[in-house]
């Protein structure tokens, strides 16, 4: 079931998913100048079985100037796709889930591909954000938000990240050094919140990057 | 069960100077930003400060900044509020807040006057 | 002043349905942050009742709901009960303060 919306928007962040849900579409767009191959096809989809996923079709560019070209260019593996996003502000990164079953890899480049990829997402699918550069995340952790179907409707939960502008980051006189976030990802503890906004505290639990133990409750 | 345990507060001259505490337990505390909200009697909630949650930055509302301070101590679990230069109008319940604020302590009554 | 808009009071009977309005700016509601509503009874800290526009916390009762559109945000209660009698506050991060904002508080009566 593909996902009506696109993930929410936050503001001075962005998102991207570490791995696609079979069933997960890509838009075959090429760059202004460019256009698809006659008979190429509109996009790439996720596909597979329990043991394997992979990219169904590929996507094709062509001069949008010469009508007769023989020129088709197909994918190139060993290239990875350079996303618009910065690094997150968190010491954490989510768990590879292209390892997961069922999930796609980012697809690799084509030749005079759009700036940016048009996906279109299905129930189960999850994206992580981070701030763009010049922000940072009030929060430590990782900020996800995942499409969920409730009541016949889909929607997508809502990410637990502010990322405020770097403006007051020095201290007044005799204020002390502030501490240095610990490495990795943070202890879990056994009782949990029980309240949860983008205003939040994020327990996370031990066994999962995807969940905390509030978020879940109400997501 | 997540709790946040104010304390500093009392009655003090304007001019004068407090600093509050708020004990933080059952939950990562290391992992959220902390801020002060403050209420004076009668009146709504007002936002005082935050601190990320490694404390490597802080912001301030325009009619506290110059003269308080907020800070953590992570391995303490522990964030606090040094107010100096107190005005009459400073007199409020402040509240620890986890997050950006979704859980609250009780607060702490901070009356200055003289 | 508060930086949200709220109305100071609103009442209704047992059993109506009262609604509850919080204006704000491009900087917080119209900039894309989320709107939380608190109860707060008399001499307790606030509680959240709405969280992320219109999502409630377990053991929020589903008479409450919320909305947002633009610039601003509401706070419906149905089903009016005496124990809903509390000052509700809106929230929203404001991007150009770098912290929350908080409406200035109604008073809701239950007649």
């Known amino acids: 079931e593909l996902c009506d919306d696109d993930p929410p928007e936050i503001p001075h962040a962005t998102f991207k998913a570490m791995a696609y849900k079979e069933g997960t579409m890509l838009n075959c767009e090429c760059k202004r100048g460019f256009r698809r191959i006659k008979s190429g096809s509109l996009y790439m989809l996720c596909t597979g079985n329990s043991s394997h996923s992979s990219w169904d079709n590929q996507c094709q560019c062509t001069s949008s100037a010469t009508r007769n070209t023989t020129k088709q260019v197909t994918p190139q593996p060993e290239e990875q796709k350079e996303r618009k996003t910065t690094e997150m502000q968190s010491p954490m990164q989510p768990v590879d889930q292209a390892s997961l079953p069922g999930h796609c890899r980012e697809p690799p480049p084509w030749e005079n591909e759009a700036t940016e990829r048009i996906y279109h997402f299905v129930v189960g699918q999850m994206v992580y954000y981070q701030c763009v550069q010049g922000y940072r995340a009030l929060h430590r952790g990782p900020a996800e938000s995942v499409c969920k179907m409730t009541h016949g409707k889909t929607r997508w939960t809502q990410p637990q990240l502010i990322c405020t502008g770097e403006m007051e980051t020095s201290q007044f006189p005799g204020e002390e050094k502030p501490q240095a976030s610990p490495e990795g990802r943070p202890e879990s503890e056994t009782s949990c919140l029980v309240t949860t906004t983008d205003f939040q505290i994020q327990t996370e639990m031990a066994a999962t990057m995807e969940t905390s133990i509030f978020t879940t409750e109400y997501q | 069960e997540v709790q946040l345990l104010e304390s500093g507060g009392g009655l003090v001259q304007p001019g004068g100077s407090l600093r509050l505490s708020c004990a933080a337990s059952?939950?990562?505390?290391?992992?959220?930003?902390m801020h002060w909200v403050r209420q004076a009697p009668g009146k709504g909630l007002e936002w005082v400060s935050v601190?990320?949650?490694?404390?490597?930055?802080?912001y301030y509302a325009d009619s506290v900044k110059g003269r308080f301070t907020i800070s953590r101590d992570n391995s303490k679990n522990t964030l606090y509020l040094q107010m100096n230069s107190l005005r009459a109008e400073d007199t409020a319940v402040y509240y620890c807040?986890?997050?950006?604020?979704?859980?609250w302590g009780q607060g702490t009554l901070v009356t200055v006057s003289s | 002043q508060s930086v949200l808009t709220q109305p100071p009071s609103a009442s209704g009977t047992p059993g109506q349905r009262v609604t509850i309005s919080c204006t704000g700016s491009?900087?917080?509601?119209?900039?894309?942050?989320?709107v939380h509503w608190y109860q707060q009874l008399p001499g307790t800290a606030p509680k959240l009742l709405i969280y992320?526009?219109?999502e409630r916390p377990s053991g929020v009762p589903d008479r409450f709901s919320g909305s947002k559109s633009g610039t601003s945000a509401s706070l419906a209660i149905s089903g009016l009960r005496s124990e809903d009698e509390a000052d509700y506050y809106c929230?929203?991060?404001?991007?150009?303060?770098?912290?929350?904002?908080f409406g200035g508080g109604t008073k809701l009566t239950v007649l």
């Open positions: 807040a986890a997050g950006v604020p979704d859980y």
């Open positions: 992320s526009n219109n």
């Open positions: 929230a929203a991060w404001d991007g150009s303060l770098n912290g929350p904002v």
């Open positions: 491009s900087s917080n509601i119209g900039a894309g942050y989320d």
């Open positions: 059952g939950f990562t505390f290391s992992s959220y930003g």
């Open positions: 601190i990320s949650y490694d404390g490597s930055y802080k």
